[in-house]
Interface confidence: low
């Protein structure tokens, strides 16, 4: 064991702790009646040098001077930074199946002498915290190496305290433990900071302080908020401070925003009125204090409040649009539909809308409330009707919104022209019109309205629609829409007291159907072939249909077939053809067209007219 | 809406100790301030310790300060109370309470567990 050394000693010259670039002689030496037996002369001492207990070298051709069987010394140099251990062990060169005998070690520490501690920084964290120091050390020594943090004042206030670094710890920071008070506001302090190792000692310069300089506040607390009359948008942010604190920095933010509101108070005593808040809305409050206007720090932020405004009743107009639907010669459906204010406008949940509808000149009046954004009611076709709807909380209703009950397509002159559908990606269509061309009244505004051409969907789902300015002529459709969908898209142009509107078919994005019309019939009328079908299922058109066409060839033939080509219209499931001859059987067969091509062929059928061709 | 559900109340000798447990639900666990509060037989419910939304902020009656521990973990949605060196004079109906921010009255109250320190 090297530790106990029982065999002999081992002494480092000039000292076991020398500066980088030093070289350093080891000497070991055998007590009296050690070593490997009666002959000295076979006592060889050998020195091994370890570094993270790793056996890096044999130092043998390093010996500078020799006592044959009783001491000799080593020589070393080129030491890295750190720690490293020698080992002086005996080897008896007359039995050499015997290991070598550790007598003993020595640790030899490389380092510097300490740099001047730099950078001193105070603080006190709140008026009852104590003054802690921190600095920057400079370049590691490699060495333990001591800190001494002394504060002198006034009054001949004196304190110091010490810590030190090695390799397993960094002194760089230490708490005095005292506290310094507002009464000394203007008093000056002055910390050094000396460091000392093995090596040498040096001393920061002296840092200098007030009191206002070094304390930094406690973060505001038990922060709270109080709305006036349950007011959403005025509210009196209200919190705990430390008394010395004269200047607050307050920043709020709805829980969604990545900006925040600031604001400076000064002498607010824990209390400050804001004014700009949004109702019914998630916010987030966080306060800052400082002791004095211009000197010192800000305080770290509160915890944040987190709160909701109260409601305010809604501001803002609803988006109207309605449906007619005659029911028979003198009643007819009218469906209500709006949309739903954005939080901005609805200050709070909405619990309800009223609906009037109301007969203008009988002064009939029908009012419901619902909590849907639809409303269907059966009226008379009879006189002129006009309709409001207004949005309640609980803290009262939004204006009511008028809309004129007009026929939305009865004024062919306020139609509007050359209206095109064009697919703009994936999901929205632009839709573009000319003006209607003889418009016996202004026009006030369009309403681009659309829904999917599927089975049901009239009564299913309601419109999606948009109002746009007269002076504009297109719109950009997105709400709702979908690749491989047909669309019925309407532009309505609306006067004060008329309607007229255009309509087109239209889709994002489109494919060939994935199937053909299926031929269910064909009869024979009046010399003619009339041939019925039924439309491709709604999810195999994969966008709109353009037209069908109807091939024939004569059966077993190798020719071409003939065809004809149908616009596609929703309503007709028939079509005759005239060119076929008598007593010939055909084989006829259906595809479908959209923009992006055409459908596989639907099922064959055979026929054979009977009747005299044309 | 917020459900309180509290647990791990139960009988306990004297010097004792019990933890129990609170999982709210139906709303983001992180921004409630949490509470327990007790009633005993006959008496007025009290508040035992408070802790803010962040867990940076306790409060306890000067009855249990340095035997009971508030503590939250925001990860497991739960909210505990050590309680250590029990006594008699503990004995109560334990209820767990929260709030939506770190001031004004406790809105959401769970149903309640018996705590009995036997001597």
């Known amino acids: 064991n090297i530790d106990v050394c029982k065999l002999g000693t081992v002494t480092v010259q000039p000292a076991p702790v020398i500066p980088l670039g030093s070289a350093a002689n080891i000497s070991c030496s055998l007590n009296p009646k050690q070593g490997c037996s009666h002959y000295p002369s076979s006592n060889e001492l050998i020195l091994l040098k370890f570094v993270n207990d790793v056996l890096v070298e044999n130092l043998h051709g390093k010996k500078v001077h020799d006592h044959t069987g009783h001491s000799s010394t080593f020589q070393v140099t080129n030491l890295s930074l750190g720690m490293t251990l020698f080992v002086c062990k005996l080897n008896c060169s007359n039995s050499q199946k015997k290991p070598p005998v550790p007598v003993c070690g020595v640790e030899i520490s490389v380092g510097v002498a300490p740099e001047p501690p730099q950078n001193i920084s105070c603080v006190q964290e709140g008026e009852n915290g104590t003054v802690a120091c921190s600095w920057n050390s400079g370049k590691v020594t490699y060495l333990k190496t001591n800190y001494t943090l002394q504060l002198s004042g006034p009054n001949n206030l004196t304190c110091q305290k010490q810590c030190f670094s090695d390799n397993r710890q960094n002194c760089n920071r230490l708490d005095l433990g005292i506290n310094l008070s507002p009464d000394l506001a203007e008093s000056r302090f002055i910390v050094r900071v000396t460091a000392i190792n093995d090596l040498g000692n040096s001393s920061s310069l002296p840092h200098t302080f007030t009191f206002l300089d070094i304390v930094i506040p406690l973060p505001p607390w038990d922060i709270r908020i109080n709305f006036l009359n349950a007011s959403g948008s005025r509210g009196t942010l209200q919190w705990e401070d430390e008394g010395q604190v004269v200047l607050n920095q307050l920043r709020y933010q709805p829980l969604n925003s990545t900006s925040w509101n600031m604001v400076n108070a000064t002498n607010a005593k824990g209390k400050y009125d804001l004014r700009d808040l949004r109702p019914f809305t998630e916010y987030e409050f966080q306060i800052s204090s400082k002791l004095h206007l211009s000197g010192g720090s800000w305080s770290n932020w509160s915890e944040s409040l987190r709160t909701r405004t109260p409601e305010e009743e809604p501001v803002g107009i609803l988006d109207i649009w309605y449906m007619k639907q005659d029911i028979d010669y003198d009643r007819q459906q009218i469906s209500l539909f709006w949309k739903s204010l954005n939080p901005s406008e609805a200050r709070g949940k909405i619990l309800h809308y009223q609906v009037t509808l109301q007969e203008v000149t009988k002064k009939t009046t029908l009012q419901n409330t619902t909590r849907h954004t639809s409303w269907t009611r059966v009226i008379p076709r009879t006189g002129a009707w006009t309709a409001s709807v207004s949005a309640a909380n609980s803290k009262g209703a939004s204006a009511p919104t008028h809309i004129n009950i007009v026929d939305l397509c009865g004024t062919g002159l306020l139609a509007p022209h050359q209206v095109s559908a064009k697919s703009e990606n994936m999901d929205n269509i632009l839709v573009t019109w000319q003006p209607p061309k003889k418009a016996d009244s202004a026009v006030r505004e369009y309403i681009v309205e659309w829904r999917a051409l599927q089975p049901g969907s009239i009564t299913k789902f309601p419109p999606h629609w948009l109002r746009i300015p007269p002076d504009n002529m297109s719109a950009l459709i997105s709400e709702n829409i979908k690749p491989y969908i047909c669309y019925e898209i309407r532009v309505h142009a609306l006067s004060e007291s008329q309607g007229g509107c255009s309509s087109i078919r239209g889709d994002s994005k489109h494919k060939a159907p994935v199937s053909g019309p299926h031929i269910t019939a064909i009869t024979e009328k009046k010399e003619r072939l009339f041939i019925s079908w039924t439309h491709i299922p709604f999810p195999e058109q994969r966008g709109c249909i353009l037209h069908y066409r109807i091939y024939w060839k004569e059966r077993d033939s190798t020719a071409q077939p003939e065809l004809c080509e149908i616009q596609y219209r929703r309503s007709q499931n028939s079509h005759p053809i005239s060119s076929l001859q008598p007593r010939v059987t055909y084989v006829l067969w259906m595809t479908a067209v959209t923009a992006a091509g055409e459908s596989p062929q639907g099922n064959e059928r055979e026929f054979c007219p009977q009747g005299k061709a044309n | 809406q917020v459900q309180l559900q509290e647990s791990g109340g139960g009988l306990v000798q004297a010097g004792g100790s019990l933890r129990l447990s609170c999982a709210p639900s139906g709303r983001t666990f992180s921004t409630l301030a949490m509470a327990w509060f007790r009633q005993a037989p006959g008496k007025e419910r009290e508040v035992v310790a408070t802790i803010s939304w962040s867990g940076g902020r306790t409060y306890y009656a000067d009855s249990v300060k340095g035997r009971f521990t508030i503590s939250r973990d925001n990860a497991k949605n739960t909210a505990y109370l050590q309680m250590n060196s029990l006594r008699p004079d503990d004995t109560a109906v334990y209820y767990c309470?929260?709030?939506?921010?770190?001031?004004?009255?406790?809105?959401?109250w769970g149903q309640g567990t018996q705590v009995t320190v036997s001597s």
């Open positions: 309470a929260a709030r939506g921010s770190d001031y004004g009255s406790y809105d959401y």
